[in-house]
Structures are given as structure tokens and as C-alpha cells.
């Protein structure tokens, strides 16, 4: 996802962005809820293609593990969160039974508020 | 990305997500920034899949598209961006070639600031 | 023990909107997609609308543009906004449990849109 | 979409029979097929899931089978309390799952 910085913008969370291999992986979380096994490789026309996934999570070096940048901490208090999407995956699950199903990913970071009571 | 209001909290940006088909994409831009068609099936070893992606884009309806919730304001401008991520789709390029091909999404609705100049 | 409370439901004219809820109790609503399934009078069951755990909505061709799904994980309910009402949504509107089978059902609640 | 084609329409059998019924796909959807059971008036309960795998607190009688294109759902000695419509679903293709049309189980 762009990179604000180019524009002379902070984000209110910072993130790190990187490809995860499914042998990385080795394991997700499918829509029904159940631990599927995420098949390192796929088969298309001509061959075997490697299942990669762009993930986006929480950045945790980054400046704003205590808490989200630029926020009035007069009358909140704030966390950055890492939110997930879902893409289908080549996956088997316990039962061994191989299928495409939809794996919850890593896809962004974002602030999430709470209002600070009794101030 | 899941729902802080069960927690009693609030998102910095209000997002809507749902789920979008290759017929209602149509087009979609690769990782070489190259338009591409994507495709409505997939082909899978008994048949076809539907190609459907999950999307999330900042809510044009919502409370936060003025700017971001939670905010200090004297410090900072701020703006609620979709942001977007790669995920592997079947596609057509312009010179009719079908393959595998990483396409942007839109995956997350983050807030970006700006510092506020000589207040 | 799970359960699913439909309201909402009645009679409207054709073009008028609704709102169904769907109370749901006796498991963590948060964690689970929600299906809205309707069956007109005398016919089969059809899928409207499905939202999964992280918020996603997915709508069936015949109600796409005039239906909102929505839900509310801190008090557990499922929304059903239903705009521009024709003849043809007539019809028991289920709320059910799940993405991909349904193990537990609301009763239903009727809908009539009729001139 | 998967179309599932239920047959037949209607099935007339005698309590302590057997009924066959059938669910076929328009593509292969796997094993991911349910199978659920209506009474007039009533919601639909979830009887087999995956092709064959009975939902919690139903009995024995009931069975599920198949793969790809073609189930069955088999009740073994009906109860008077089975004679219902039966519905078939498909959650291989997601979205959109389908249903079937039914099968309507009347006692003769």
C-alpha cells in the first residue's frame, strides 16, 4: 500500500509490508474458524507455482507501539492494531481433504480509540 | 479487519468492506502497473471457481470522511486513505496472455497526517 | 444455548423500506458470519445476504443495490436494511448461523410487500 | 452459479421405509454439501454437513454420501416425525451458496 512519507505525511500507525511464503506460514485460519495447513505450492497449466501473500501488520519497532501518532490524548486513549482480510488459498485441512478456501490474513494497521473516562 | 466496537472502541476511520467479484472488477492493475482483465473463473481440478476478492475502502458515508476521529487538531491535518495490497488473481494482460498475476486491492482505510505550518 | 430472534418484519408497499434484526445469544456473535435466507410462500430457500466475522457483506444479484447488511458485535445483532421493496421480496426472512452451512436458525420473520 | 437439482420433487413412502434421495450439482462442489430438513412452519435444521457428516443430535437413520457431482441422503426406517422437505446446499463455490429446490418426504 502507497507510502504516505512521499507526500509529506505521517500515518497515525506505523507498518512493515512483506511477502510470506506458504512453507512461512505453514498454517492459517479459514473461514468456518478451523486450522487449515496452507499448501506450499499450486498447480496451474504449466507447472507449480509458489503461494505467496503481501502481508501488512503493526510495526513492532516502530515509534508507535505505546500508542497512535497525532492523537488529542486529552480525551482518548489509542492502540494500533494489525486488521485482517481474506484470500483464497490452496489449503487441506484436517481431515486431508485439499481445497481452495479463504485464509484470514495480515492486511494493514490501524488505530483503534477508546474515550478516557473521569478525566 | 474485525469489528472494535465490541470492545467499546472506535476506528480513527470508518471502513466498509465486502465482497467483490471479477465481473464486478472487471480490470485491475498488476504489480508492473500494467492494466489487466481479470478474469470471472478459475479453473480447479474438478471444475471452476469463482474469482472473488475481499475488499475494504474507506466508508464515503461514514462519520470520518472530513477527517480522522480522535485527532489533535491544533497539531495536525488529517485524512481517512484507502490503502491498498497485492493479491494473486488469473488475469488477461493486452497482449491476450493469460496467467497468475499479483493485482492491487483495496485492503485497509488508515489515517495519514499532516503537520499544521506556522499556527 | 444458541439463538437467533428475527423482528422487523410486515407489511409495506412496494418501494417502502424495512429493517430486520437479528438478536443473537449463547455464543460469541463476534467470532461468527451471519447468513440472512429467505423462502417465499410455498417455494425453496434463497441466500440474500452474508456477512463474515471481520465485516465483509456479500449480497445475491436479485437484492444487490437496495439491500445493506450490517452488524453490531457489541450487543449482537444482525442487521437487515432492505430499500425499494418489490412484490417479489415477499417472503420469511431467516437470520442463520455460519459462512458456509447453517447449524442454527432464527425462526423467521415475514415479510409482505404488497399494493 | 452451482445449480444442485434435487430429485424426485416428491417421494411417497410408508413409515419404517427407506428414502433415497438426490442432489446433483451442475460442477463438482467436492464434499462441501449439506443437507437440511423443513417442517411446515418451521426453520430449517442442518442434518448431514461435508457430504456426510451428521449435525449434533441427529439420529443415526440418517446418512449422507457422495462426492463431486452426485449425493444422496438415505433415511433409513421413516419416523413419522421425518416426512418433511429435505433441501440440499452448496458451500464449494463461495459465494454464492445455492440450495436445491427440495424434495417434499409424504407419507403414502
Known amino acids: 500500500h502507497s507510502d504516505p512519507a512521499r507526500r509529506g505525511e505521517l500515518s497515525v500507525c506505523d507498518s512493515i509490508s512483506e511477502w510470506v511464503t506458504a512453507a512461512d506460514k505453514k498454517t492459517a485460519v479459514d473461514m468456518s474458524g478451523g486450522t487449515v495447513t496452507v499448501l506450499e505450492k499450486v498447480p496451474v497449466s504449466k507447472g507449480q507455482l509458489k503461494q505467496y501473500f503481501y502481508e501488512t501488520k503493526c510495526n513492532p519497532m516502530g515509534y508507535t507501539k505505546e500508542g497512535c501518532r497525532g492523537i488529542d490524548k486529552r480525551h482518548w486513549n489509542s492502540q494500533c492494531r494489525t486488521t485482517q482480510s481474506y484470500v483464497r488459498a490452496l489449503t487441506m485441512d484436517s481431515k486431508k481433504r485439499i481445497g481452495w478456501r479463504f485464509i484470514r490474513i495480515d492486511t494493514s494497521c490501524v488505530c483503534t480509540l477508546t474515550i478516557k473516562r473521569g478525566r | 479487519h474485525s469489528d472494535p466496537a465490541r470492545r467499546g472502541e472506535l476506528s480513527v476511520c470508518d471502513s466498509i468492506s465486502e465482497w467483490v467479484t471479477a465481473a464486478d472488477k472487471k480490470t485491475a492493475v498488476d504489480m508492473s502497473g500494467g492494466t489487466v482483465t481479470v478474469l470471472e473463473k478459475v479453473p480447479v481440478s474438478k471444475g471452476q471457481l469463482k474469482q472473488y476478492f475481499y475488499e475494504t475502502k474507506c466508508n464515503p458515508m461514514g462519520y470520518t470522511k472530513e477527517g480522522c476521529r480522535g485527532i489533535d487538531k491544533r497539531h495536525w491535518n488529517s485524512q481517512c486513505r484507502t490503502t491498498q495490497s497485492y493479491v494473486r488473481a488469473l488475469t488477461m494482460d493486452s497482449k491476450k496472455r493469460i496467467g497468475w498475476r499479483f493485482i492491487r486491492i483495496d485492503t485497509s482505510c488508515v489515517c495519514t497526517l499532516t503537520i499544521k505550518r506556522g499556527r | 444455548d444458541v439463538q437467533l430472534v428475527e423482528s422487523g418484519g410486515g407489511v409495506v408497499r412496494p418501494g417502502e423500506s424495512l429493517r430486520l434484526s437479528c438478536t443473537a445469544s449463547?455464543?460469541?456473535?463476534?467470532?461468527?458470519?451471519m447468513t440472512w435466507v429467505r423462502q417465499p410462500p410455498g417455494k425453496g430457500l434463497e441466500l440474500v445476504s452474508h456477512?463474515?466475522?471481520?465485516?465483509?457483506?456479500y449480497y445475491a444479484d436479485s437484492v444487490k443495490g437496495r439491500i445493506t447488511v450490517s452488524r453490531d458485535n457489541s450487543n449482537g445483532t444482525l442487521y437487515l436494511q432492505m430499500n425499494s421493496l418489490r412484490v417479489e421480496d415477499t417472503a420469511v426472512y431467516y437470520c442463520a448461523r455460519g459462512n458456509t452451512f447453517f447449524e442454527y436458525w432464527g425462526l423467521g420473520i415475514l415479510v409482505t410487500v404488497s399494493s | 452459479e452451482i445449480v444442485l437439482t434435487q430429485s424426485p420433487g416428491t417421494l411417497s413412502l410408508s413409515p419404517g421405509e427407506r428414502a433415497t434421495l438426490t442432489c446433483r450439482a451442475s460442477?463438482?462442489?467436492?464434499?462441501?454439501l449439506a443437507w437440511y430438513q423443513q417442517k411446515p412452519g418451521q426453520a430449517p435444521r442442518l442434518l448431514i454437513y461435508d457430504s456426510s457428516r451428521r449435525a449434533t443430535g441427529i439420529p443415526d437413520r440418517f446418512s449422507g454420501s457422495g462426492s463431486g457431482t452426485d449425493f444422496t441422503l438415505t433415511i433409513n426406517r421413516l419416523e413419522p416425525e421425518d416426512f418433511a422437505v429435505y433441501y440440499c446446499q452448496q458451500y464449494y463455490d463461495w459465494p454464492p451458496l445455492t440450495f436445491g429446490g427440495g424434495t417434499k418426504v409424504e407419507i403414502k
Open positions: 456477512i463474515v466475522d471481520l465485516g465483509g457483506a
Open positions: 449463547g455464543f460469541d456473535f463476534s467470532r461468527y458470519g
Open positions: 460442477q463438482s462442489v467436492g464434499s462441501d
